[in-house]
């Protein structure tokens, strides 16, 4: 069965099956390089 990609909070459909958070937070550290 089809899974709908995680959509942001104002979208009508949302599921975590995409493996991505609905509204990912900004990383708080910066990788070297």
């Amino acid at each position: 069965s089809e899974t709908t990609t995680g959509t942001s909070s104002n979208s009508s459909q949302s599921t975590s099956n995409s493996g991505l958070a609905p509204n990912p937070t900004n990383a708080t550290t910066k990788a070297a390089g």
Epitope: T4, T5, T7, S8, Q13, G19, L20, P24
Partner: antibody, heavy 115, light 112 residues
């Protein structure tokens, strides 16, 4: 069966431009965020860009290294996502995969940036 | 960016042996909805990546039950109870909690 098919890769000189396309089938395309991921021997897998839904006003996100150079767009009527790449650099070389998230991946299209 | 560190770099095993791959993130991957967006992918030689596991431990359809994912916060593990020939390739962890999404460097599973 979900299929994502990329095209548009090739050879380009530094500073040049290229436009990649990805046609999706087997899914309700307008309901899916779409992403481009790059793979290179030097840098491994790296997420490049994302475009969200019409209901999100087609919001886009980019990794810092491509901001101002790459533009992701989509045509829901054609179930297609695009990646317009300008001012290309050698480090942009790699296989570009179209993905819905982490779940579905295309076969990839190769871009080589070299003089 | 969130750094994803995978160990070991290479696993060289015989058919039937167990395998364990570690993935550590530089920040917690627990999202505000209570879910942890940690995924495992397998890239077989000459192929594109294929997802095995999402949300730490949820297996995708068609994935053999010899694969299990576990962990929380910053420390995650992929285990294969008994390695089979079709398992060879490079395993990647990837986080979808923080922007930009980031991948581990990969663990190559070789069959002796």
């Amino acid at each position: 069966e979900v299929r994502l098919e990329e095209s548009g890769g090739g050879f380009v000189q530094p500073g040049g431009s290229m436009k990649l396309s990805c046609v999706a089938s087997g899914l309700t395309f307008p309901n899916h965020w779409m992403n481009w991921v790059r793979q290179s021997p030097e840098r491994g897998l790296a997420w490049v860009a994302q475009i969200q839904l019409k209901s999100d006003n087609y919001a886009t996100r980019y990794v810092e290294s491509v901001k101002g150079r790459f533009t992701i767009s989509r045509d829901d009527s054609e179930s297609t996502v695009y990646l317009q790449m300008n001012n290309l650099r050698a480090e942009d070389t790699g296989i570009y995969y179209c993905t819905t998230g982490t779940d579905y991946w295309g076969q990839g299209t190769t871009l080589t940036v070299s003089s | 960016d969130v750094v994803m560190t995978q160990t070991p770099l290479t696993l060289s095993l015989t058919i039937g042996q167990p395998a364990s791959i570690s993935c550590k993130s530089s920040q917690s991957l627990l999202y505000s909805d209570g879910k942890t967006y940690l995924n495992w992918l397998l890239q077989r030689p000459g192929q594109s990546p294929k997802r095995l596991i999402y949300l730490v431990s949820n297996m995708d359809s068609g994935v053999p039950d010899r694969f299990t994912g576990s962990g929380s916060g910053t420390d995650f593990t992929l285990k294969i109870s008994r390695v089979e020939a079709e398992d060879l390739g490079i395993y990647y962890c990837v986080q979808g909690t923080h922007f930009p999404y980031t991948f581990g460097g990969g663990t190559k599973l070789e069959i002796k």
